[in-house]
Interface confidence: low
C-alpha cells in the first residue's frame, strides 16, 4: 500500500491555516486499524500518533517552511511512509503604511496622552514597526509583531513634542515608511500679567494710558479681554500670540482696579489686579494718577 | 532604483545669486528629508541644511540661515539651493543627500560652484 | 553643535593590514530609548560623493564589504577595516545625527 501526503492549501500564505491528510489511495483507513503520524523535517508534530488522518494546523509562518511527510501504522506495528513534500509558506510584503493619532488630527493637549499608530494595509509573519522624529528621523522606539499595527505612546506630551513624526514597517522586503505626521501640542494659557504704560511718570487727566495684557505661555490665538474693576472695557486678540493692548483716554472715574484676562479655548486666566490712584501733589494744578 | 541628480558646475561673479537642483526618482519623494551639504576645495564635509518634502518645511545650519535658502517642487520631484550674496569663500562643491532614519544613505554626484571676478 | 574629532588625519596601511580610525564626540550619541547610538561613517573617494558605510555606531549598509566594521557607544567610536585593499584608498568621514547632523574633519586612509 502507498501512502500519500496532501496540504491543503499547498502553497499557504503566512498565518493561514493548513490541513496535512494522510492518503492511503488503495487501502481504505476503515479496513484496518491505522495510527497516523506528521513530520516536518525529523520532527513529528502536533499529538504524535493518532488514529485521525488529518491534522490541522492553526496558522502556518514563513519559519514553517519545509519538508513534511506522513506515516501509517498497523496493529501489526507494519509502518508505511510517505514521500516528503515540501510546503513553502508564502510571506506577504507589507505594504500602504500609514501613521495615524489618538486624540486624531495630531492636535494634543499639553500633558495628555498621545499615541502614534502605525498601521499596514496588508503584510504577513513578524512585522517590525519603527516610530521617527524630528529633524533627522531619531528612532523613537521599535516594536515587532505579528498584527497589522503597532502603538508608540508618549504618556504625557510636553510641548517640544510637537514635531513630524513617520512610522516605518519592515518584514523582510526593505522598509517601508508611512507620510510624515505632523503633531500640534495644544497649550492652556498662563496667568497674564497687566502692565499700565502711560506716556509720562505721572499720568494727568485727558493722557493716553495703555493697558497691556501678555501670557507669556498658551497656544495662539489668544483673546484678551480688559476689566475696570468688573466692568468690560473691551477684548483684543493675538492671532499669532503674544500680547494685546488696550487704550484708555483718562478721566478722574478711571482710578480703582484694573485687571485683565486670557483665554485661547483650552481655559482662561485672569491676572492681579493693579489699583490706579489719583492724586493731587501739593501745589499742583492738575490731578495726577499713581499706580 | 534610487538617484539623485544634480544640475551642472556654475562660474559666478560676487555678489551674484545661484540656484542648484536636484532631482530625485526611484522613490517616493515625499517620505525622506533632503539634505544639503557643502564641501569646499580639499576640506570637510560641512552641512547646510534640510526640508522636509511633504511640508515644505526647512531648517538650517544657523552658519548658512542668511545664505542659503532650499525649497521643493513635488510635482517633479525636485529639491532646490538658492545660495545668495556670493563671495569666494563660497567656492564649493555642494551635495544634495537623502537621509533614512538620520543616515545619509544616497547621495547626488555633486555640483560645483566657483566664485569669480 | 556636537563637535566630532577624529584621529589620525591620516593613516599609512600596508595591504591586507588593519586600518582603525576613532570619531570622539562633544556629547554623547546613545539615545536611551532605544540604546542606539546616533553615529554614521562614509567613506568619499577623489572627485566622488561620500558612501555611507555604517550606521547605528555598527550597522553596515548593505553592499558594504565585511571587512568594514564599526564599533564604540556614547561618545568614542572605532571604524576598523580589517584587511586594506587597494580599492579602500579614500577620506573616511563619522557623523553624528542626534542632532543636526556634523562631521568629523576627515582621516585619509593610503597604502604604504
Known amino acids: 500500500a502507498e501512502l500519500f501526503l496532501i496540504a491543503s492549501p499547498s502553497h499557504p500564505t503566512e498565518g493561514s491555516p493548513v490541513t496535512l491528510t494522510c492518503k492511503m489511495p488503495f487501502l481504505q483507513s476503515s479496513d484496518a486499524q491505522f495510527q497516523f503520524c506528521f513530520f516536518r523535517d525529523t520532527r513529528a508534530l502536533g499529538p504524535g500518533w493518532s488514529s485521525s488522518p488529518k491534522l490541522q494546523i492553526a496558522a502556518m509562518w514563513k519559519e514553517d517552511t519545509g519538508s513534511y511527510w506522513c506515516e501509517a501504522q498497523t496493529m501489526a506495528s507494519k509502518v508505511l511512509r510517505s514521500r516528503r513534500s515540501q510546503i513553502n509558506v508564502h510571506r506577504v510584503p507589507v505594504a500602504d503604511v500609514s501613521l495615524e493619532t489618538q486624540p486624531p488630527g495630531g492636535q494634543v493637549m499639553e500633558g495628555d496622552r498621545l499615541v502614534l499608530i502605525c498601521s499596514v494595509a496588508m503584510g504577513t509573519g513578524d512585522i517590525t514597526f519603527l516610530w521617527y522624529k524630528g529633524a533627522v528621523g531619531l528612532n523613537l522606539q521599535s516594536k515587532t509583531q505579528r498584527s497589522l499595527t503597532a502603538e508608540y505612546e508618549i504618556p504625557s506630551v510636553r510641548e517640544s513634542d510637537a514635531e513630524q513624526y513617520y512610522c516605518v514597517a519592515e518584514n523582510g522586503y526593505g522598509p517601508s515608511p508611512s507620510g510624515l505626521v505632523s503633531i500640534t501640542v495644544r497649550i492652556p494659557v498662563s496667568r497674564p500679567i497687566l502692565m499700565l504704560r502711560a506716556p509720562r511718570a505721572q499720568a494727568a487727566v485727558e493722557d493716553v494710558l495703555e493697558l497691556h495684557c501678555e501670557a507669556l505661555r498658551g497656544s495662539p490665538p489668544i483673546l484678551y479681554w480688559f476689566y475696570h474693576e468688573d466692568i468690560t472695557l473691551g477684548s483684543r486678540s493675538a492671532p499669532s500670540g503674544g500680547g494685546a493692548s488696550f487704550n484708555l483716554s483718562l478721566t478722574e472715574e478711571h482710578s480703582g482696579n484694573y485687571s485683565c484676562e486670557a483665554n485661547n479655548g483650552l481655559g482662561a486666566q485672569r491676572s492681579e489686579a493693579v489699583t490706579l490712584n489719583f492724586t493731587v501733589p501739593t501745589g499742583a494744578r492738575s490731578n495726577h494718577l499713581t499706580s | 532604483q534610487v538617484q539623485l541628480v544634480q544640475s551642472g558646475a556654475e562660474v559666478k561673479k560676487p555678489g551674484a545669486s545661484v540656484k542648484v537642483s536636484c532631482k530625485a526618482s526611484?522613490?517616493?519623494?515625499?517620505?525622506?528629508?533632503m539634505h544639503w551639504v557643502k564641501q569646499a576645495p580639499g576640506q570637510g564635509l560641512e552641512w547646510i541644511g534640510r526640508?522636509?518634502?511633504?511640508?515644505?518645511?526647512?531648517k538650517y545650519n544657523e552658519k548658512f540661515k542668511s545664505k542659503a535658502t532650499i525649497t521643493v517642487d513635488k510635482s517633479t520631484s525636485t529639491a532646490y539651493m538658492e545660495l545668495s550674496s556670493l563671495r569666494s569663500e563660497d567656492t564649493a562643491v555642494y551635495y544634495c543627500?537623502?537621509?533614512?532614519?538620520?543616515?545619509?544613505?544616497?547621495w547626488g554626484q555633486g555640483t560645483l560652484v566657483t566664485v569669480s571676478s | 553643535d556636537i563637535v566630532m574629532t577624529q584621529s589620525p588625519d591620516s593613516l599609512a596601511v600596508s595591504l591586507g593590514e588593519r586600518a582603525t580610525i576613532n570619531c570622539k564626540s562633544s556629547?554623547?550619541?546613545?539615545?536611551?530609548?532605544?540604546?542606539?547610538?546616533?553615529l554614521a561613517w562614509y567613506q568619499q573617494k577623489p572627485g566622488q560623493p561620500p558612501k555611507l558605510l555604517i550606521y547605528?555606531?555598527?550597522t553596515r549598509e548593505s553592499g558594504v564589504p565585511d571587512r568594514f566594521s564599526g564599533s564604540g557607544s556614547g561618545t568614542d567610536f572605532t571604524l576598523t577595516i580589517s584587511s586594506l585593499q587597494a580599492e579602500d584608498v579614500a577620506v573616511y568621514y563619522c557623523?553624528?545625527?542626534?542632532?543636526?547632523?556634523?562631521f568629523g574633519q576627515g582621516t585619509k586612509v593610503e597604502i604604504k
Open positions: 556629547q554623547s550619541l546613545l539615545y536611551s530609548s532605544n540604546q542606539k547610538n546616533y
Open positions: 557623523q553624528q545625527y542626534s542632532n543636526y547632523p556634523t
Open positions: 526611484g522613490y517616493t519623494f515625499t517620505r525622506y528629508w
Open positions: 547605528w555606531a555598527s
Open positions: 526640508i522636509d518634502p511633504n511640508s515644505g518645511g526647512s
Open positions: 543627500t537623502r537621509v533614512n532614519s538620520g543616515a545619509m544613505d544616497y
